[in-house]
């Protein structure tokens, strides 16, 4: 029977800036049974705070609601295992929620074949950003890539939409049924999850030619 | 711990390319920046670019043209190529880890360089 | 780029006493996400820079706190309460809101 082995804060997520949670990896429980507690204190200050949710995140986790997240601190952490043997402590890891955003996937996704009579005929791809991303404060700048696949092919094509909302591609196979899926990311955060896919039917009388 | 330690080749005859390794343990490069500066003998630092924890990448705009940041996750390992080089790019190079988790500033932990001298 | 200019360029100090050194940006240096990193380094001879302060005012982990920043915009001052041998060397300011990063030419804190 030992202390328990060292624990690492190995990932923190945010949705929005306005809320966020961290997940921690045990070390070796020593053969014994390991209490967690996750600590913490924001820049500027010294007194120490536990971690105010460990439910909404699931196993080994710590959730800050709104109430405890605010973008302009830094948040130093720690998490602490400890059996009858003795504690042992994380790494303390310094979290700006600014950095560790990763959105839900976009919304709305809708796709269209356009075929103007005087000139190529193209798909039109349009989507929302997700909902609980506020872009009007301009702290978010968000950027979108869409990939779309006929059917049954295995590779995906891709292309990034830079801060666009909506997207034109030009090289299709008439006649085939597509898959296509957007997805979008901070600028310096995580990409989101692929959004649903949307089938659309090309015409088999679409054509590529000038 | 978190270290990190540089490897070069110590010396580079001009116009030749240069190669140094950060090679760091102690944490993910998947979840923590890694940035590259220099300092010639004497003189200031000078911060030349970064690699961000998804890979993504942001370099100095004067050296831009001949510079590339590369990594290897899995052998935790950090690559600075610098074409074209010259005399005056001689230097001590020195790789450093963000301190923010998934951020890119303040460089918490520091190699101990590696000197690159260009020369005939 | 971002300038940044640090004064004075070398300060002789009694120890014990207390030292300031400004750095002024070219530009704001806050980050469109509203915050300014804003840091301070210090350099012993044959070394690698250390962290002192980041975000203006906050102290790494360590720190003493007889070390403070402050500032805001684009003027910005690293005070140390009372010198003490340890803390001579060459402090460095450094933006990280703009790419690309820039620092201070530095400061050689050396004894009067």
């Known amino acids: 029977q030992l202390p328990p082995g060292k624990p690492e804060i190995f990932k923190c997520r945010s949705p929005n800036k306005e809320t966020f949670t961290c997940w921690w990896r045990p070390g070796t429980d020593g053969g014994l049974p390991t209490n967690y507690s996750l600590t913490y204190h924001r820049e500027g200050e010294t007194l120490m705070h536990e971690c105010p949710d460990y439910i909404t995140g699931g196993p080994n986790s710590c959730h800050f609601g709104k109430q405890y997240t605010s973008m302009w601190r830094t948040y130093i952490m720690m998490v602490n295992a400890t059996n009858q043997m003795g504690s042992s402590f994380s790494d303390e890891l310094y979290v700006d929620v600014t950095y560790i955003v990763q959105p839900d996937p976009p919304l709305e996704l809708a796709v269209e074949v356009k075929q103007p009579e005087d000139r190529k005929p193209y798909l039109w791809i349009k989507w929302s950003p997700p909902t609980l991303i506020d872009l009007k404060t301009g702290w978010f700048t968000l950027l979108y890539e869409i990939r779309l696949k006929p059917e049954k092919a295995a590779e995906w094509e891709i292309h990034f939409a830079g801060q666009q909302t909506e997207f034109k591609i030009l090289s299709l196979h008439p006649g085939q049924k597509y898959l296509v899926q957007v997805r979008c990311k901070p600028d310096h955060g995580y990409w989101s999850a692929w959004s649903p896919a949307t089938f659309i039917q090309i015409p088999s009388d679409f054509t590529m030619n000038d | 711990q978190v270290q990190l330690k540089e490897s070069g080749p110590g010396l580079v005859a001009p116009s030749q390319s240069l190669s140094i390794t950060c090679t760091v343990s102690?944490?993910?490069?998947?979840?923590?920046?890694v940035n590259w500066f220099r300092q010639p003998p004497g003189r200031g630092l000078e911060w030349l670019g970064m690699i961000w924890g998804d890979g993504s990448t942001d370099y100095n705009s004067a050296l831009k043209s001949r510079l590339s940041i590369s990594k290897d996750n899995s052998k935790s390992q950090v690559f600075l190529k610098m074409n074209s080089l010259q005399t005056d790019d001689t230097a001590r190079y020195y790789c450093a880890r963000v301190l923010y988790y998934y951020g890119g500033n303040s460089f918490a932990y520091w190699g101990q360089g590696t000197l690159v001298t260009v020369s005939a | 780029d971002v300038l940044m200019t640090q004064t004075p360029l070398s300060l002789p100090v009694s120890l014990g006493d207390q030292a300031s050194i400004s750095c002024r940006s070219s530009q704001s240096i806050v980050h469109s996400n509203g915050n300014t990193y804003l840091e301070w380094y210090l350099q012993k001879p044959g070394q690698s820079p250390k962290l002192l302060i980041y975000?203006?005012?906050s102290r790494f982990s360590g720190v003493p706190d007889r070390f403070s920043g402050s500032g805001s915009g684009t003027d910005f001052t690293l005070k140390i309460s009372r010198v003490e041998a340890e803390d001579l060397g060459v402090y460095y300011c450094?933006?990280?809101?703009?790419?690309?990063?820039?620092f201070g030419g530095g400061t050689k804190l050396e004894i009067k």
């Open positions: 975000k203006v005012s």
């Open positions: 102690g944490f993910s490069l998947t979840g923590f920046g």
């Open positions: 450094f933006q990280g809101s703009h790419v690309p990063y820039t």
